[in-house]
């Protein structure tokens, strides 16, 4: 028999015993002779065993066998045998079966020898052999009863030598991660998803995560696949804050000068054309009318001043038209039209008169008669033992039909040091200095102004029927934006349909939605997609011409010459074109400056623009009197200066 | 600034003249006309009328037709009234007012008192 | 002539209460009605013109309203600087005409 080290060095000391089989077996002889054939005293086994422990042992056990089965003349068999077996302590086997490869008798003892992995007295102790260097295995050790066994964590398979470990790739099999990207880990394997996406191990697929659940914008959320956007309230004045989520407030990056003269009357404040000033003259004694004041405009068309009775009757009217001055009048019903001299709207200031002599009305320009009209009676109308005049500024107390030939009473134009009627009243003075709304800006270029706080609108069509082609329908927009901004957020120019729909919309916006970059851009979109985007330098007090075109496969965006890149595919292109298209057949509004109060995520911009701008749409300068609606704030035909600062 | 200045109080007896002026400073004299407001102690004021600086023509109403006359001195941009016949119910504070159809600049007024 | 009915003559009021004047008159005048304020030893100080327009100057607790034949003139918190004799005067006709006056007084 072969025996392990263990086994040999547990065998050591029992060996050395063996040496002394032979005597064993005469020790046997002599016991049958001594104590089975006939009785033996303790001293007499004595000489038997040749040594204590085995007496002490033998002798007590011997005397039971007596007990038992009788004395040895008694010749019971069985004396014989349970005298015999007294010496054998390995019979009955005291050793434990499962774990014991074999008993050693010993004198008055016993050997129990271990099979492996067992131990203690009687084997029955099994031995844990991951305790001592983890049994030999690489990762883990299971210890079993007279046994252990090494195994591998998840995703590692055990080697062929039974100890070690080795990384499965769970991502050989196509089928581990479905459709997401499968990466393989040390013992493990991660199926990964872009960003914006989870992965469900339910679908084995990259699902959409909804940011919006989230609460991660400020105000309002849209998700979209893979990605979210946040708007915020443009029209309240918010854009988007550098980190896409919160919001801030728009504040302009090209101070422009605002201020206002307090010693001055804005003619232009009401766009419904009514006047800002309405004066009632009356006197016991006959009067004339003497009107002079100082007068600045850039506004080819519009009314000065009225000054007479009801339509029907005696009155005056002082406007321009092209440019130059026209006096439209009637007495006793009888009209007529009157206009000569320069042109006066070139933004300088210069004085004008009116004044009622005995039988004529002289009209002077920087104190040169520029007219002179013959006139049957006064403007002062007698009634009731009264004189009464009604004198109205920038506008007419009546409807424009009623003039001589209608006019657009509305007038972006400025007065000061007025004088009517030689008059000392300081009614208006005092009205103007409490209202800044009836000052003037203080100086003026040509433009539109945009104060950020509302918008314009026209009814404009961008469709014709071609006659040449029947009843094919043709369309095009195409914008020149001429613009200096004061903010670097808001809509220049937008269409807007039925529901308030925003079909196109032309905006400066500081940032890339999708690239989620802040960047000063002009960004031409439909409805909500962004056609192109152009990038500007939105806050360097200069003018910058922004040019749209639009028609059948075509959307080009230009700034300063430059071309926009586009945003859309050919395909989405052509798409959001027949989209377009299909809208302009129904109502639209052409929107100037802002949007009307559409949801914030209908179009990329919806805050107002702030700053100068000049408007063509297909080939015709939009003058924002004529507009079908105009924001009071908005100045039609002058803008206030960039402010220059120096350092 | 627009001024109506008029001269000072008089006490007069029954039967006597009196001529008040009202010195006007502050803008054109002819471009307005001149108004007389009578108001007795204690009582309300009365529109005795008018004088057209440009013509010197004065309309009184009918209370105060007769005894009662304006007048002016465009040179002194001044407009007087005279009473003539003076009774005890001429006592009053007479005040001069600028016509702008209504009375915006008034003279501070001036008390006359007839008593015996 | 068109002749000025007002009401009341007198009334009397506490500091920052509400005064209302009215004058009714005797034919249609339009919004021709303007209302003066007299403090003792003063002349009358306009303070509505016709169309109901208050005068430059004049604090804003003063208004008035009124068209045709029928009209109101309000003193909204009144103060004690308030105390005066109030009149209204048409100036739709000739002659003009004043209202009988109304003394204020406090409380």
């Known amino acids: 028999v072969l025996l392990r080290a263990r086994e040999a060095a547990q065998f050591l000391r029992p060996r050395q015993r063996r040496a002394y089989q032979v005597f064993e077996e005469a020790k046997q002889g002599h016991l049958e002779r001594e104590c089975v054939e006939e009785v033996c005293s303790k001293e007499e086994a004595r000489e038997v065993f040749e040594n204590d422990p085995e007496t002490d042992y033998f002798y007590p056990r011997y005397q039971e066998c007596m007990r038992k089965y009788g004395r040895p003349e008694d010749k019971n068999p069985n004396f014989a045998t349970c005298v015999k077996n007294l010496p054998d302590q390995c019979t009955p086997n005291p050793c434990d079966k499962k774990g014991t490869q074999l008993c050693q008798d010993l004198m008055g003892n016993f050997f129990c020898l271990c099979k492996d992995g067992w131990g203690g007295r009687l084997c029955d102790k099994d031995v844990n052999e991951c305790s001592q260097k983890n049994g030999g295995c690489s990762q883990v050790c299971h210890n079993k009863p007279g046994s252990f066994q090494c195994a591998c964590h998840s995703g590692f398979s055990l080697q062929s030598d039974n100890k070690s470990c080795q990384d499965i790739d769970e991502c050989t099999d196509s089928d581990t991660c479905g459709d997401a990207r499968c990466k393989n880990l040390p013992g493990s394997y991660s199926c990964l998803c872009d960003k914006g996406y989870t992965y469900s191990s339910k679908e084995k697929t990259c699902q959409d995560v909804d940011e919006c659940q989230q609460d991660r914008c400020e105000q309002t959320c849209v998700n979209s696949p893979g990605s979210y956007t946040c708007h915020c309230n443009g029209r309240g004045g918010l854009k988007l804050s550098p980190d896409m989520d919160t919001c801030e407030d728009i504040l302009p990056c090209v101070p422009f000068s605002m201020a206002k003269s307090v010693k001055s009357l804005y003619l232009g404040r009401m766009f419904s054309g009514t006047p800002v000033i309405r004066l009632r003259f009356k006197r016991l004694q006959p009067t004339r009318l003497l009107a002079e004041f100082d007068f600045r405009t850039f506004d080819p068309e519009g009314v000065l001043f009225f000054a007479g009775g009801r339509s029907d009757s005696t009155w005056i009217v002082l406007g321009l038209r092209a440019g130059r001055l026209e006096l439209q009048l009637r007495y006793n019903g009888v009209g007529r039209i009157t206009s000569s001299g320069p042109t006066i709207n070139h933004g300088m200031w210069q004085t004008i008169s009116v004044e009622e002599l005995d039988r004529n009305l002289v009209i002077k320009v920087n104190k040169d008669a520029v007219m002179k009209i013959a006139v049957a009676g006064g403007l002062f109308q007698l009634e009731r033992g009264l004189y009464h005049l009604n004198l109205t500024v920038g506008g007419i107390p009546f409807k424009e039909s009623d003039l001589v030939q209608p006019i657009n009473p509305r007038l972006d134009g400025c007065m000061r040091s007025w004088n009517w009627l030689n008059g000392e009243d300081s009614a208006i003075q005092e009205t103007v200095k409490a209202n800044t709304k009836m000052q003037c800006f203080s100086v003026t270029e040509r433009g539109s102004f945009f104060p950020g706080n509302g918008f314009a609108f026209y009814s404009l069509n961008y469709t014709r029927t071609s006659l040449d082609v029947g009843t094919e329908t043709t369309w095009e927009v195409e914008v020149v934006a001429r613009i200096r901004p004061a903010t670097d957020t808001g809509v220049l120019m937008a269409l807007v349909g039925d529901k308030d729909v925003v079909l196109l919309s032309v905006a400066l916006v500081d940032y890339h939605s999708t690239k989620k970059l802040k960047k000063q851009l002009v960004v031409l979109a439909v409805e909500n997609v962004a056609l192109a985007l152009m990038e500007i330098k939105v806050c360097d007090s200069q003018e910058h011409t922004v040019t749209v075109s639009l028609r059948d496969g075509e959307a080009t965006l230009e700034v300063d010459g430059t071309k926009g890149q586009s945003e859309v595919s050919t395909a989405q292109l052509q798409e959001r074109l027949d989209l377009l298209k299909t809208r302009l057949q129904g109502s639209v509004l052409t929107f100037v400056g802002g949007l009307p109060d559409v949801q914030v995520t209908s179009t990329p911009v919806t805050a107002f623009y702030r700053g100068c701008m000049t408007l063509e749409v297909n080939g015709k300068t939009l003058d924002l009197d004529t507009a079908s609606y105009k924001h009071s704030d908005i100045t039609s035909h002058s803008c206030p200066p960039v402010e220059h600062v120096t350092a | 600034q627009i001024q109506l200045v008029q001269s000072g109080p008089e006490l007069k007896k029954p039967g006597e003249t009196v001529k008040i002026s009202c010195r006007a400073s502050g803008y054109t004299f002819t471009n307005y006309g001149m108004n007389w407001v009578k108001q007795a102690p204690g009582k309300g004021l009365k529109w005795m009328g008018w004088i057209n600086t440009n013509t010197g023509e004065p309309t009184y109403t009918e209370e105060f037709k007769g005894r009662f006359a304006f007048s002016l001195e465009t040179s002194a941009t001044t407009a007087y009234l005279q009473i003539n016949d003076l009774k005890n119910e001429d006592t009053a504070t007479y005040f001069c007012a600028r016509d702008e159809g209504w009375f915006v600049y008034w003279g501070q007024g001036t008390l006359i008192t007839v008593s015996a | 002539e068109t002749t000025v009915t007002q009401s009341p003559a007198s009334l009397s009021v506490a500091t920052g209460e509400k005064v209302t004047i009215r004058c009714i008159t005797s034919?249609?005048?339009?919004?021709?009605m303007n209302w003066y304020q007299q403090k003792p030893g003063e002349p009358p100080k306009l303070l509505i013109s016709e169309g109901n327009t208050l005068r430059p100057g004049v604090p804003s607790r003063f208004s008035s309203s009124g068209y045709g034949t029928d009209f109101v003139f309000t003193i909204e918190n009144t103060l004690s600087e308030d105390v005066a004799d109030y009149y209204c005067l048409q100036t739709d006709s000739v002659p003009l005409t004043f209202g009988a006056g109304t003394k204020l007084e406090l409380k």
């Open positions: 034919t249609d005048i339009d919004d021709d």
